[in-house]
Interface confidence: medium
């Protein structure tokens, strides 16, 4: 039967915007790396559509991966981790379209994770801690976070604090007395490695002591 | 055609600086992490420093650590290799090497034909 | 960092033998792995990579296996141009290095 029908599909399909973005994920089971890749158009139809990474692999020359509803992903402990590997959007053995990406300079850590906040009576401040994966981890050790926090009822006002360690204090006198706080941290790959802010941690909400009148202090 | 041309070498004093060059052709430089690998006389290969295509990962030998630098220059598709505080055993032939990541892991599958430094007094 | 020890260091055959030369590296590295042939006077050419994969335009006498610590160059028959000397060739992508065996010197008997 020949194959002819198709092409006429084929040729459609190229008028389509096949961009894409993705994100390496690395040690994030074990010692095993993700890559996710995704279609910036959320109305690409992406029957029959795969990806495929070839190059920067060690003992395989191509990768496929695996379709998880509108994402593309792969698992594996395959990526060597230096140089460029090309990444395309195939339909049957033919490329849409292709780009060379280091894997290392679209890394997205993992979530942190164990925010809280504890008030020191004593200092008049408060202490943040949270914890990170990466720690642990042989790669992607060095991480630059990002505590966010906010009045509660401030819905877009947020501060930003950056940090390279886990562990943030607060100055009392900073925050408004009596009030509702929600605080979230997220990290992004600094040192060697590049890429992506991770997903925010799980907020933590905190209230600040009311003013004592007496001293001009919160209690 | 893919090429690696050396130059640079030369006779210097121990203690003495020396740079020596890679010029590139006939593929695509910033794809590709790039090596110096040098072979004093007699003896075998050794593997003295890499840099990776975006020069954010480079290595050395613990034999010129402190001492040698690469470096390099993607939009004249050259690559560097500058060695300080020069001793006599750093008389070598030294390779300039691409590697080629595709086949699967590093390989170096272009070598240029080296550049020789000798450090005498 | 992996040490890789080529055994032996030289050997002498003749033209038509069947010759095999190992590495073995003191730690293990899956199958990232390749030989190289340097023959006086000239830079070193890929004949190997992945333990097992030969290179483009290499002739098929050349094989490789192995994995893990123990790897294997085979030549099944011995040509005059073959007389050279072999590098075994692992890396590590993180901190970057990349170590060379000794070499294994092959002479003609």
């Known amino acids: 039967e020949s194959g002819y029908a198709q092409n006429g599909d084929l040729e459609d399909a190229e008028l389509d915007d096949y961009s894409f973005s993705c994100y390496s994920q690395l040690e994030v089971n074990g010692s095993q790396h993700s890559l996710t890749c995704a279609f910036e158009d959320p109305d690409v139809n992406t029957t029959n559509l795969e990806f495929e990474i070839c190059g920067a692999l060690v003992e395989v020359k191509c990768l496929n991966f695996r379709k998880l509803q509108e994402i593309y992903f792969i698992e594996t402990k395959k990526f060597l981790l230096i140089g460029k590997s090309n990444i395309c959007v195939k339909v049957g053995e033919k490329s849409l379209t292709c780009k060379k990406i280091d894997l290392t300079t679209i890394v997205k850590p993992e979530a942190p994770f164990d925010l809280s906040v504890i008030y020191r009576e004593g200092a008049n401040d408060f202490v943040v801690t949270f914890n990170t994966s990466h720690l642990q981890k042989k790669y992607v050790k060095v991480l630059m976070h990002d505590v966010a926090y906010r009045q509660e009822k401030d819905e877009n006002k947020w501060t930003h604090v950056n940090l390279s360690s886990t562990k943030l204090t607060l100055l009392q006198r900073k925050l408004q007395p009596a009030a509702m706080y929600e605080i979230k941290v997220r990290s992004i790959p600094d040192h060697y490695f590049k890429g992506f802010w991770s997903e925010w941690s799980p907020s933590y909400y905190f209230r600040t002591p009311e003013i004592n009148n007496s001293s001009g202090e919160m209690d | 055609e893919v090429q690696l041309v050396e130059s640079g070498g030369g006779l210097v004093q121990p203690g003495r600086s020396l740079r020596l060059s890679c010029a590139a052709s006939?593929?695509?430089?910033?794809?590709?992490?790039m090596h110096w690998v040098r072979q004093a006389p007699g003896k075998g290969l050794e593997w003295v420093s890499g840099i990776s295509w975006n020069s954010r990962g480079i290595g050395y030998a613990d034999s010129v650590k402190g001492r040698f630098t690469i470096f390099r220059d993607n939009a004249k598709n050259s690559l560097y290799l500058q060695m300080n505080s020069l001793r006599a055993e750093d008389t070598a032939l030294y390779y300039c090497?691409?590697?080629?990541?595709?086949?699967?892991?590093?390989?170096?599958?272009?070598w240029g034909q080296g550049t020789t430094v000798t450090v005498s007094s | 960092a992996i040490q890789l020890t080529q055994s032996p260091s030289s050997l002498s055959a003749s033209v038509g033998d069947r010759v095999t030369i190992t590495c073995r590296a003191s730690?293990?590295?899956?199958?990232?792995l390749a030989w190289y042939q340097q023959k006086p006077g000239k830079a070193p050419k890929l004949l190997i990579y992945d333990a097992s994969s030969l290179e483009s335009g290499v002739p098929s006498r050349f094989s490789g296996s192995g994995s893990g610590t123990d790897f294997t160059l085979t030549i099944s028959s011995l040509q005059p141009e073959d007389f050279a000397t072999y590098y075994c060739?692992?890396?590590?992508?993180?901190?970057?290095?990349?170590?060379f065996g000794q070499g294994t010197r092959l002479e003609i008997k």
């Open positions: 730690q293990g590295a899956s199958s990232a």
């Open positions: 006939g593929f695509t430089f910033d794809d590709h992490a």
């Open positions: 060739q692992q890396f590590n992508s993180y901190p970057l290095w990349i170590t």
């Open positions: 090497a691409k590697d080629e990541y595709s086949r699967g892991y590093y390989v170096l599958d272009v």
